[in-house]
Interface confidence: low
C-alpha cells in the first residue's frame, strides 16, 4: 500500500532525502526526445541484505529519432558498506546513508535522464525539513517527517519545524549553508506525487515493504 | 561563505592530458559527495565522475578508463586527471558537492562551483 499523502508542506522549507530502503524502486524515465532503449530495464530496485544493498538494474535511454544508438551512462550499482569513520552524528544531523544498513545510496546520474526522478519507496522512508534560504529555522522538536502504517492506514508526522524570515538559512547541525535553495516546483496531478528539487535528503527507518512514491527533480 | 573554485582547464591535444582541480572552503568537505560535470555550449549537464565521502568513486562510460578522480581532504580539494582526451571531452568542467550523493548540476548540487573550460583540438 502506498504512503496515501504527500509530505507535509512546511511553508518556506524544503525537505531532503538521503537514502532509499530495500524494496525502492526508481522509475526509469528519459528526457524529451529520448527513450528507454527496447530491452532496458522499466525501474532500478534496491536489493540486497543487511550488510549489502545495491540498485538492480541499469537505467539507458537512447535517442527517439534513433534505432541503432544507444547512448548510456551505466551508474554502476552502488554497494552499500559500513561508513569508514569515527565521526560522530548529533542527534539531529540526517545519518549519512553509508552508516544505514539495508539501504542503497542515490544513484549516480545516467545520461539523458529525465528532469524528474520518481521513486517508490517503502514506507518508512524520513525526510529532513530546512528553511529555503532567507528563513531560519525554529525548532519545537524533530524537522523530520516519517511515512508510518498505522492501523492499516499510511500517515506522516508532523515536522516541528517553523521558518520566520529575514534571517540566513538555518541548516541541520554539521551542514553548511548551500548556495541555493530553489523553491518548490509545482506538484504532480497524481496525489501520490511529490515534486520536488533534489536538494533532498531521506532517511529510512521502518521494516514494512509498503511502497510509496517520491520524486526528485534534476537537470 | 562556500565556495568551489575550479582550474587546471586550457587547450589539449588529443590523446593529451590536463589535471582539473577545485578547491573548496566554507563547508565540511570531508562529509560531501562531489562529483565533476560538464557541459558543452547550448547542451545540458552531463554527470562525469564522483566520489563519495568515504572514497567510493563512480564513472560515466564515456570517460571510464580515461580519467580518474581522486580527492584530498586534508586539502579540501577535489581532483580529475584527463588522460586520453577526446575532441568530444571539450566542455566547460564544474565540480559540484551533495550531502550524501552524486550530483550533476547547478540545481542538483547543493554547493556548484564557476566551472573551468577545457578544449581538447589538435
Known amino acids: 500500500e502506498l504512503c496515501d499523502d504527500d509530505p507535509p508542506e512546511i511553508p518556506h522549507a524544503t525537505f531532503k532525502a538521503m537514502a532509499y530502503k530495500e524494496g525502492t524502486m526508481l522509475n526509469c524515465e528519459c528526457k524529451r526526445g529520448f527513450r528507454r532503449i527496447k530491452s532496458g530495464s522499466l525501474y532500478m530496485l534496491c536489493t540486497g541484505n543487511s550488510s549489502h544493498s545495491s540498485w538492480d538494474n541499469q537505467c539507458q535511454c537512447t535517442s527517439s529519432a534513433t534505432r541503432n544508438t544507444t547512448k548510456q551512462v551505466t551508474p554502476q550499482p552502488e554497494e552499500q558498506k559500513e561508513r569508514k569513520t569515527t565521526e560522530m552524528q548529533s542527534p539531529m544531523q540526517p545519518v549519512d546513508q553509508a552508516s544505514l544498513p539495508g539501504h542503497c545510496r542515490e544513484p549516480p546520474p545516467w545520461e539523458n535522464e529525465a528532469t524528474e526522478r520518481i521513486y517508490h519507496f517503502v514506507v518508512g522512508q524520513m525526510v529532513y525539513y530546512q528553511c529555503v534560504q532567507g528563513y531560519r529555522a525554529l525548532h519545537r522538536g524533530p524537522a523530520e517527517s516519517v511515512c508510518k502504517m498505522t492501523h492499516g492506514k499510511t500517515r506522516w508526522t508532523q515536522p516541528q519545524l517553523i521558518c520566520t524570515g529575514e534571517m540566513e538559512t538555518s541548516q541541520f547541525p554539521g551542514e553548511e549553508k548551500p548556495q541555493a535553495s530553489p523553491e518548490g516546483r509545482p506538484e504532480s496531478e497524481t496525489s501520490c506525487l511529490v515534486t520536488t528539487t533534489d536538494f533532498q535528503i531521506q532517511t529510512e527507518m521502518a521494516a514494512t515493504m509498503e511502497t510509496s512514491i517520491f520524486t526528485t527533480e534534476y537537470q | 561563505q562556500v565556495q568551489l573554485v575550479e582550474s587546471g582547464g586550457g587547450l589539449a591535444q588529443p590523446g593529451g592530458s590536463l589535471r582539473l582541480s577545485c578547491a573548496a572552503s566554507?563547508?565540511?568537505?570531508?562529509?560531501?559527495?562531489v562529483s565533476w560535470a560538464r557541459q558543452v555550449a547550448g547542451e545540458g549537464f552531463e554527470w562525469v565522475s564522483g566520489?563519495?565521502?568515504?572514497?567510493?568513486?563512480y564513472y560515466a562510460d564515456s570517460v571510464k578508463d580515461r580519467f580518474i578522480i581522486s580527492r584530498d581532504n586534508a586539502k579540501n580539494t577535489l581532483y580529475l586527471q584527463m588522460n586520453s582526451l577526446k575532441p568530444e571531452d571539450t566542455a566547460l568542467y564544474y565540480c559540484?558537492?551533495?550531502?550524501?550523493?552524486?550530483?550533476?548540476?547547478?540545481?542538483?548540487?547543493?554547493?556548484w562551483g564557476q566551472g573551468t573550460q577545457v578544449t581538447v583540438s589538435s
Open positions: 566554507g563547508f565540511t568537505f570531508s562529509n560531501f559527495a
Open positions: 559540484g558537492a551533495a550531502r550524501g550523493r552524486l550530483c550533476s548540476s547547478i540545481m542538483t548540487c547543493d554547493y
Open positions: 566520489v563519495y565521502s568515504d572514497g567510493d568513486t
